[in-house]
Amino acid sequence: MKVLQEPTCVSDYMSISTCEWKMNGPTNCSTELRLLYQLVFLLSEAHTCIPENNGGAGCVCHLLMDDVVSADNYTLDLWAGQQLLWKGSFKPSEHVKPRAPGNLTVHTNVSDTLLLTWSNPYPPDNYLYNHLTYAVNIWSENDPADFRIYNVTYLEPSLRIAASTLKSGISYRARVRAWAQCYNTTWSEWSPSTKWHNSYREPFEQH
């Protein structure tokens, strides 16, 4: 049994880091493998993560952490029974993938303005809480070409757009994702999408 692709890990910078790797053949990850992780601190102890299958030869493990700070470093040991298959280290702050925003809501009752709001996925005491920026994706269910991205570079989790920038009388969907420049993170996953029917009063044409 050998590791074909070494574990790569990303952290949500709150409580979970996710590591993925591939073995050289079909593997029952949960019964054959264990990933041990330990904070590099004299008095810390190793924790055991039981991996799950992620495709035939792929494994994924969700490492639980009390919290994360920028200088934390973890040792990682991948074991198959008594055999050490791989040894490495992981600094969560250098591999951050933020949590996805939630509770995306479209408010359509604000005088021909669409107000989209969502929730910051972090509690106020987490460093990322004040460092997230967002991308909002809006698309038409009827027209695949009607697809747009709005970059929200301010901290407030909301976006206002004129309803008239979208076509009237058809249904749209929106979703939002987040990233943090301070840690050069990857983008989060998209939030669940929300749907609304776009309608607004056409302005009277004057001749």
Epitope: S44, D66, A71
Partner: antibody, heavy 116, light 110 residues
């Protein structure tokens, strides 16, 4: 809110014994290493002993090795320090501290006086 | 005598910047993370800096830590009267297999 409350201090004669306790609340005690640090009157801080979350790793300062025993009861959220063969130089305020990356939370301390 | 050497005292006027040094060796500061603790008069110590330069939440950014080789420093800018306290550096010493504190520095705000 993390809280650490030491108890068990008092006056004891040289050669005597004392058992200190530290009751922890506000965090998952079994996930954290714990330590004892002392401070003699008018002096600086001196590390005494540390214990890992499960109790599998234990460390002592040379000045107390063989006389003091650190232990913990994770079911009771309590840290202990059994002190035997006490000497005058053990007189100090004894603090318990949660130990995660550093001694990040401290109790208010309990005074141990060794005197005849 | 401590294996970590700190000046016994330091002082400054309100608004000033003061620096407290901590000198060790390769068996302690040179290869381990340095922590700084503040002890206000009559109270328990409080963690001020960990991992050489990290501040716990709630510690003002007026406090900063740094490390170079076998020495560490604590800087306090915009000095305030409430900063008057004893400050201790600390780290693990591999050769002693012990957690060691500096002797402490008494900071006076004039």
């Amino acid at each position: 809110e993390v809280q650490l409350l030491e108890s068990g201090g008092g006056l004891v004669q040289p050669g005597g014994s004392l058992r200190l306790s530290c009751a922890a609340s506000g965090f998952t005690f079994s996930n954290y290493a714990m330590s004892w640090v002392r401070q003699a009157p008018g002096k600086g801080l001196e590390w005494v002993s540390s214990i890992s979350p499960s109790g599998s790793s234990i460390y002592y300062a040379d000045s107390v090795k063989g006389r003091f025993t650190i232990s913990r009861d994770n079911s009771k959220n309590t840290l202990y320090l059994q002190m035997n063969s006490l000497r005058a130089e053990d007189t100090a305020v004894y603090y318990c501290a949660r130990s995660y990356r550093a001694f990040d939370y401290w109790g208010q301390g309990t005074l141990v006086t060794v005197s005849s | 005598q401590s294996v970590l050497t700190q000046p016994p005292s330091a002082s400054g006027t309100p608004g000033q910047r003061v620096t407290i040094s901590c000198t060790g060796s390769s068996s302690n500061i040179g290869n381990n993370d340095v922590n700084w603790y503040q002890q206000l008069p009559g109270t328990a110590p409080k963690l001020l800096i960990y991992y050489d330069s990290q501040r716990p939440s709630g510690v003002p950014d007026r406090f900063s830590g740094s490390k170079s080789g076998t020495s560490a420093s604590l800087a306090i800018s915009g000095l305030r009267s409430e900063d008057e306290a004893d400050y201790y550096c600390a780290t693990w010493d591999a050769s002693l297999s012990a957690y060691v504190f500096g002797g402490g520095t008494k900071l006076t705000v004039l």
